[in-house]
């Protein structure tokens, strides 16, 4: 049932980095509480000005990132996992995906690899989010599962409703946003359309349903005739600046 799933809506203003792009760049559908430390490739970094990309598996992250819980030693189950910068040569690792391209994990250390070892950045597949069969899900965790999709669909820009990984996969006027069963190309919001404004940073979790951001010259503001409504039901719409 819905109770086991995080279902907060979200307007995704900042878009994730392009497929295979560098990690550690701003842009994502999820905020993590400011000041949280995470272990990147070589040192601890603060998340104050960092908008991490949420993930459930390594393949969803860029080629020089891996998916992990932001705090060292956290199990990750039931908590938000994000894409972290890959580990450089001779750094500690637990699996191949933690190591930067050209390296693989051997005996807990990132080592240089020959071409036969896991060239993840060259794999001709993109990983697209979707909700897995419920018998595959960890009990009650409600987290997305992943499925591969051949990258040929990225040679043409996705139309409304087609699956995507990043907004750059979508045609003009569309953004890439979660829609229950996967991430799909949705229309950027027009004037008067309902938008989502989060009450506070870090409140939106891994969404099941996301709205695009408001189009150019528009802002997501509370609808004037809804000022009297209770806090929980106040309606936000895209309005002229």
């Amino acid at each position: 049932t819905l109770n086991s799933v995080l279902i907060n809506s979200n307007a995704i203003k900042n878009l994730p980095p392009p497929l295979g792009g560098a990690g550690g760049q701003p842009g994502s559908a999820v905020s993590v509480a400011p000041g949280v430390l995470y272990e990147g490739g070589n040192k601890y970094q603060t998340l104050d000005n960092y908008q991490p990309y949420p993930c459930a598996e390594d393949e969803e992250c860029g080629s020089d990132e891996y998916c992990s819980s932001p705090s060292r030693g956290a199990a990750g189950v039931g908590g938000v996992q994000i894409c972290l910068a890959c580990r450089k040569r001779r750094k500690r690792c637990m699996r191949h995906a933690m190591c930067c391209p050209g390296n693989y994990c051997k005996n807990g250390i990132c080592m240089p690899s020959d071409h036969s070892h896991f060239p993840r950045g060259e794999i001709e597949e993109s990983i697209i989010e979707n909700l897995g069969n419920d018998h595959n899900a960890a009990a009650g965790d409600g987290y997305p599962r992943r499925t591969t999709l051949t990258s040929k669909i990225y040679h043409t820009k996705g139309q409304e409703g087609s699956v995507c990984l990043r907004s750059s996969d979508c045609a003009a006027g569309l953004c890439c946003a979660r829609h229950f069963w996967s991430k799909i190309c949705k229309p950027v919001l027009k004037e008067g359309q309902v938008c989502t404004k989060h009450k506070r940073k870090g409140s939106h979790g891994l969404e099941i349903f996301q709205r695009c951001y408001c189009g150019e010259g528009l802002a997501c503001r509370i609808q004037k005739d809804h000022h009297q409504a209770s806090n929980s039901s106040r309606l936000h719409t895209c309005q002229r600046h």
Partner: antibody, heavy 116, light 112 residues
């Protein structure tokens, strides 16, 4: 333009089997989830099953779980519904629908009649 | 199980406005904040008219509008026309496992 054409419906006895097909055209079939929705004569719509673009994830209504199997062949742009152990209450028009922004395109449907 | 409840029938004269309601349990329309509306003419396939409560797909007349308040979503048709006579279904999603849930449908009759 987007087109979905169902086939394979017909008269079948209770306990029998039937395989429905849905031929898709006018869009990149492998980029969309697909589903089956049915409508019993004079009744409302009932969602039957859904399948991910790659076919690795499938979901079913409780009423058909264990009896119906949804599948797809992306090389043929075709969606399937294998229906086993059919019952009188499965009599309905079966629609295939594209799961884009919700069920955004539907076929015209194929009638399945389960009767002795 | 989640459930969506619609009136069995509504009617109106040409040019009038009518509203069809769809009331859901808190885990679907209210809590989920997402509902779609479909139009179905007799013997035809359903057609998506509204998604995300109030958004019209391209090609749908702006006489059709959607809104939501609390646990009730509404479809309003203004400037009623004879061709609007059809059955209308609201729909929402349960996501674990993924299941589409439809309201029972509302038959719209255009009088005269």
């Amino acid at each position: 333009q987007v087109q979905l054409v169902e086939s394979g419906g017909g008269l079948v006895q209770p306990g029998g089997s039937l395989r429905l097909s849905c031929a898709a055209s006018g869009f990149t079939f492998s980029s969309y989830w697909m589903s089956w929705v049915r409508q019993a004569p004079g009744k409302g719509l009932e969602w039957v099953s859904g399948i991910s673009y790659s076919g690795s994830n499938t979901h079913y209504a409780d009423s058909v779980k264990g009896r119906f199997t949804i599948s797809r062949d992306n090389s043929k742009n075709t969606l399937y519904l294998q229906m086993n152990s059919l019952r009188a209450e499965d009599t309905a028009v079966y629609y295939c629908a594209r799961m884009g922004i919700d069920l955004d395109y539907w076929g015209q449907g194929t009638l399945v009649t389960v009767s002795s | 199980d989640i459930a969506l409840t619609q009136p069995a029938s509504v009617s109106g004269s040409p040019g009038q406005s009518i509203t069809i309601s769809c009331t859901g349990t808190s885990s679907d329309v209210g809590g989920f904040n997402y509902v779609s509306w479909y139009q179905q003419h007799p013997g035809k396939a359903p057609k998506l008219m509204i998604h995300d409560g109030s958004n019209r797909p391209s090609g749908v007349s702006n006489r059709f509008s959607g809104s939501k308040s609390g646990n009730t979503a509404s479809l309003t048709i203004s400037g009623l026309q004879a061709e609007d006579e059809a059955d209308y279904y609201c729909q929402s999603w349960d996501v674990s496992p993924i299941t589409a849930v439809f309201g029972g449908g509302t038959k719209l009759t255009v009088l005269g």
